[in-house]
C-alpha cells in the first residue's frame, strides 16, 4: 500500500524506524508517520573569517584549495593542516587536488585536463564525491572536489558514504545502495551478516535502506537456527555456497 | 561551486497556483534525495516533501498533500514543487534542501494573498 | 513526529562568555549506520539556515571552533565557549533520522 514502508531492505538489523513506525526486523513493514504522505548553494556567510583554516581533508577545502601541512606537500603528514592555495600548470604535485580547477596531477606535474587530449570514447564523465566525512565538504560553505574526471587516466572511486548512481562507482568491496533518499556506496556483506532475500522481482515495498549483496562465494539463505521461526521473520545472513 | 538556487517565488491569489524551481550545481545532484522546506514569516521551519534520488519516491506532510506535487528532472539537475489551490497559510520562503549532506538554496518568497 | 525541545527559549550574553543550549528530541536519533543524525544551526533575520554542527558533534567547514555539539540518544548540548557580536541569532536544532524532518522551537540569543 502507499504507506507501507520496507524499512529494513538489506539495512542494518535493529534498525530504529525511520518513519515513525514500529519494528526494526528484516522487511517488517511499517506505516508512514502521522502527518505523512507517500506518493508511491547556497554559498552561506561565514562566522568570522577564520583564517589559515585548518582541515583534515581536501574535501573541506575550497575548490582553489587543497590541505596539507604548511612545510608539507603531502596531506596526512604530522603536524597541523591547513588549506592551502592550488598548485598552478606546471607545478609540482602528488596528487589531483593540490592542482588547480581544470587540471589535474600527472606525473608529478599539474597538467591542464583538456578532454581533446585524450582518444574519443576514452572519456567517461563522473563526479564523485567523498562523503565519508559526510558533510564536511558541502554544506556550510565548503566545496566538494567536483572534477570531471577520465576514467582510465584519474577516476576516483568514492569511498563508504560517497554518494553513487551505480556500484561501478564505488571502490571495491563497496556497492551503491540507497540510504534515506539517496543513493550511497556501502560495504558488500561478509560471512554471518544480515542479508535480505526479496522472494520475487518487484515483490518487496519501499526500501529506504538498502544492505549490499552477500560478497564473492557467499549466498543469502536462513540462517540455521532460525528455520524455526515463523515465515515472515527468518533471518536471512550470508554464508557460503 | 556547490549550490542551490531557488525560483519562481511571488504574489498569488488564494486558489491559483505556483511552480517552484530549484537548480543545484556542483554536485551529483542525481545521486541525492531532495527536500523542501518552508518558514512562515516571524515562524520556525516546516517540511513539506522529499523526492527520492530518481524520483520515484515521494513523501508530502499533511498540509500540502492533494495540492502540492515534487518532481525532478535529473537531466537538468532541477527540483520542483507544484503548487495548486495555494492558501493564505502556504505563505513562506520555500528552500530547496539536499539530505544526507544537509545543503539549503537561499530561499524564494510565496505570497498568498487577494 | 519526533518532537524536538530546546532550552533556553532565549539566552542574553556577555561577549567573551559562554553559552549553552539543550535540545531534547521526542525519540533516539541514533541511525543503525552508527550516525546520529542532529543538527544545529544559525539563522539571522532575512538569511536561509547558517548550519553549523551535524551528526551531533562535527562542524561544517568554516565554522569557528568556538562552536561544539556533544550528546547523544536524546539529549544533545550547543556550546559556545566565547559568544562574539556577530553570534547572535536564533539557534536550533533539527533531525533528520524520521520523516517529517522536525526541528525545535528557536532560541534566541543576544548580546548584554
Known amino acids: 500500500t502507499l504507506n507501507s514502508v520496507l524499512i529494513n531492505s538489506n539495512a542494518i538489523k535493529n534498525l530504529p524506524p525511520p518513519l515513525g513506525g514500529a519494528g526494526g526486523q528484516p522487511g517488517s513493514a511499517v506505516s508512514v508517520a502521522p502527518g505523512v504522505l507517500y506518493e508511491g548553494g547556497n554559498k552561506y556567510q561565514t562566522l568570522d573569517n577564520y583564517q589559515p583554516y585548518p582541515c583534515a581533508e581536501d574535501e573541506e577545502c575550497g575548490s582553489d584549495e587543497y590541505c596539507s601541512s604548511p612545510s608539507r606537500g603531502a596531506a596526512g603528514v604530522g603536524g597541523v593542516q591547513i588549506c592551502l592555495a592550488c598548485r598552478k600548470r606546471r607545478k609540482r604535485c602528488m596528487r589531483h587536488a593540490m592542482c588547480c580547477p581544470g587540471n589535474y596531477c600527472k606525473n608529478g606535474i599539474c597538467m591542464p585536463s583538456d578532454h581533446s587530449h585524450f582518444p574519443r570514447g576514452e572519456i567517461e564523465e563522473s563526479i564523485i564525491e567523498n562523503l565519508g566525512n559526510d558533510h564536511n565538504a558541502a554544506a556550510g560553505d565548503g566545496y566538494p572536489r567536483r572534477t570531471t574526471l577520465t576514467s582510465k587516466i584519474y577516476h576516483t572511486k568514492g569511498q563508504e558514504g560517497s554518494v553513487c548512481l551505480r556500484s561501478s562507482d564505488c571502490a571495491a568491496g563497496l556497492c551503491c545502495a540507497r540510504h534515506f533518499w539517496s543513493k550511497i556506496c556501502k560495504p558488500v556483506l561478509k560471512e554471518g551478516q544480515v542479508c535480505t532475500k526479496h522472494k520475487r522481482k518487484g515483490s518487496h515495498g519501499l526500501e529506504i535502506f538498502q544492505r549490499c549483496y552477500c560478497g564473492e562465494g557467499l549466498a543469502c539463505r536462513i540462517q540455521k537456527d532460525h528455520h524455526q521461526a515463523s515465515n515472515s521473520s527468518r533471518l536471512h545472513t550470508c554464508q557460503r555456497h | 561551486q556547490v549550490q542551490l538556487v531557488e525560483s519562481g517565488g511571488g504574489v498569488v491569489q488564494p486558489g491559483r497556483s505556483l511552480r517552484l524551481s530549484c537548480a543545484a550545481s556542483g554536485f551529483t545532484f542525481s545521486g541525492y534525495g531532495m527536500h523542501w522546506v518552508r518558514q512562515a514569516p516571524g515562524k520556525g521551519l516546516e517540511w513539506v516533501a522529499v523526492i527520492s534520488y530518481d524520483g520515484n519516491d515521494k513523501y508530502y506532510a499533511d498540509s500540502v498533500k492533494g495540492r502540492f506535487t515534487i518532481s525532478r528532472d535529473n537531466a537538468k539537475n532541477t527540483l520542483y514543487l507544484q503548487m495548486n489551490s495555494l492558501r493564505a497559510e502556504d505563505t513562506a520562503v520555500y528552500y530547496c534542501?539536499?539530505?544526507?549532506?544537509?545543503?539549503w538554496g537561499q530561499g524564494t518568497l510565496v505570497t498568498v494573498s487577494s | 513526529d519526533i518532537v524536538m525541545t530546546q532550552t533556553p527559549l532565549s539566552l542574553s550574553v556577555t561577549p567573551g562568555q559562554p553559552a549553552s543550549i539543550s535540545c531534547k528530541s521526542g525519540?533516539?536519533?541514533?541511525?543503525?549506520?552508527?550516525?546520529?543524525?542532529l543538527y544545529w544551526y544559525l539563522q539571522k533575520p532575512g538569511q536561509p539556515p547558517q548550519f553549523l554542527i551535524y551528526e551531533v558533534s562535527n562542524r561544517f567547514s568554516r565554522v569557528p571552533d568556538r562552536f561544539s555539539g556533544s550528546g547523544s540518544g536524546t539529549d544533545f548540548t550547543l556550546r559556545i565557549s566565547r559568544v562574539e557580536a556577530e553570534d547572535v541569532g536564533i539557534y536550533y536544532c533539527m533531525q533528520s533520522i524520521q520523516l517529517p524532518w522536525t526541528f525545535g522551537q528557536g532560541t534566541q540569543v543576544e548580546i548584554k
Open positions: 525519540q533516539s536519533l541514533l541511525h543503525s549506520d552508527g550516525k546520529t543524525y
Open positions: 534542501a539536499r539530505e544526507l549532506r544537509v545543503l
